[in-house]
């Protein structure tokens, strides 16, 4: 790499993937291994993110861009940039501080992540329960009770209080 010739800042011409090396009279040196600079004119290269533990590499680091991580099987990403990995649970469960727990009666979770949510209260929309809910599935609401034969039930139990979902550190 040639020494830069900018009158204002000799570092301004150093391209992405290099840094302006003060130990070498401000010439543009390539980023060391496992580091990168995504913009020009940098005085240091940033060290690449290492995807370790429950993280795995989704995109390798290059001299101009950082590595990107996702999660190993059995875990899923949380937060922007996959800052954390959270344990998967089965459908019909939620993650608590004590691990995966079945949804309480009257609640469901149709995913491997997130919290159990209350079944839909069909009667709030003037409808009746067509298909009962389970731990894995919400109720299916049908026609309004007036359209049904006498004796049809439209009551769903209230959702019990639950411990909130937990993100393990």
């Amino acid at each position: 790499f040639e020494r830069t010739r900018s009158l204002q800042d000799p570092c301004s011409n150093c391209p992405a993937g290099t840094f302006c090396d003060n130990n070498r009279n401000q010439i543009c040196s390539p980023c060391p291994p496992n580091s990168f600079s995504s913009a020009g004119g940098q005085r240091t290269c940033d060290i690449c993110r290492q995807c370790k533990g429950v993280f795995r590499t989704r995109k390798e680091c290059s001299s101009t861009s950082n590595a990107e991580c996702d999660c190993t099987p059995g875990f899923h990403c949380l937060g922007a940039g996959c800052s954390m990995c959270e344990q998967d649970c089965k459908q019909g469960q939620e993650l608590t501080k004590k691990g995966c727990k079945d949804c309480c009666f009257g609640t469901f979770n149709d995913q491997k992540r997130g919290i159990c949510r209350p079944w839909t209260n069909c009667s709030l929309d003037g409808k009746s329960v067509l298909v009962n809910g389970t731990k894995e599935r919400d109720v299916v609401c049908g026609p309004s009770p007036a359209d049904l034969s006498p004796g049809a039930s439209s009551v769903t139990p209230p959702a019990p209080a639950r411990e909130p979902g937990h993100s393990p550190q």
């Epitope: 291994p33 496992n34 240091t44 940033d46 060290i47 690449c48 993110r49 290492q50 370790k52 533990g53 590499t57 950082n66 949380l78 937060g79 922007a80 940039g81 800052s83 954390m84 993100s167 550190q169």
Partner: antibody
Framework: QVQLQESGPGLVKPSETLSLTCTVS????????WSWIRQPPGKGLEWMGY???????NINPSLKSRVTISVDTSKNQFSLKLSSVTAADTAVYYC????????????WGQGTLVTVSS | EIVMTQSPLSLPVTPGEPASISCRSS???????????LDWYLQKPGQSPQLLIY???NRASGVPDRFSGSGSGTDFTLKISRVEAEDVGVYYC?????????FGQGTKLEIK
């Protein structure tokens, strides 16, 4: 270039809460982990915990019950709160940019001495 | 947590002479693709620590090439080929494989 600056009271009374803020300049707080590390006078370095700009945290188990770390992306700042302090918490407190979530602290603040005394 | 042990704890060196610091971890720091999660830091008197070496052997950008890191698994070495007066301070190794990251006790390098 990225610069970090710690700020907060230099003297805290025992049993009270220590509060420090780290202001990041010369770059965005986004896309990195941000750590707090402390050093008692004449002793070694202890990592306290990190926060990601999205708010995810990881705290050293030895301090977990007492430490809270938060982030304010609009101000490019992150903060440390350490509750129920004792004289053993007297230290220089550093904030640092953490490249991988618990590793390679490439940029450090200059540090601020916090003394716990009545 | 992983325990880091450094030796020696004190290192008097004559300027221009080489210096070597050893660091041992209680478990292997070797991870995928041969990457060792081991950093070296220098804390000069009255200053913040500065990163010298990451990944066991990668010199951080801007660090003079008289500094080099080597080793793998549990045994690592920081070498200074020719010590200069500005190299005085305390050198720390740190494992970055698991949280919490943990530091060695430090090695104080002083000029004879």
């Amino acid at each position: 270039q990225v610069q970090l600056q710690e700020s907060g009271p230099g003297l805290v009374k025992p049993s009270e809460t220590l509060s420090l803020t780290c202001t990041v300049s010369g770059g965005s707080i986004s896309s990195y982990y941000w750590s707090w590390i402390r050093q008692p006078p004449g002793k070694g370095l202890e990592w306290m915990g990190y926060i990601y700009y999205s708010g995810s945290t990881n705290i050293n188990p030895s301090l977990k019950s007492r430490v809270t770390i938060s982030v304010d992306t609009s101000k490019n700042q992150f903060s440390l709160k350490l509750s129920s302090v004792t004289a053993a918490d007297t230290a220089v407190y550093y904030c640092a940019r953490d490249q991988s979530g618990g590793g390679s602290f490439q940029h450090w603040g200059q540090g601020t001495l916090v003394t716990v005394s009545s | 947590e992983i325990v880091m042990t450094q030796s020696p704890l004190s290192l008097p060196v004559t300027p221009g002479e080489p210096a070597s610091i050893s660091c041992r971890s209680s478990q292997s720091l070797l991870y995928s693709q041969g990457y060792n999660h081991l950093d070296w830091y220098l804390q000069k008197p009255g200053q913040s620590p500065q990163l010298l070496i990451y990944g066991g052997s990668n010199r951080a950008s801007g660090v003079p090439d008289r500094f080099s890191g080597s080793g793998s698994g549990t045994d690592f070495t920081l070498k200074i080929s020719r010590v200069e007066a500005e190299d005085v301070g305390v050198y720390y190794c740190m494992q970055a494989l698991q949280t919490p990251p943990t530091f060695g006790q430090g090695t104080k390098l002083e000029i004879k």
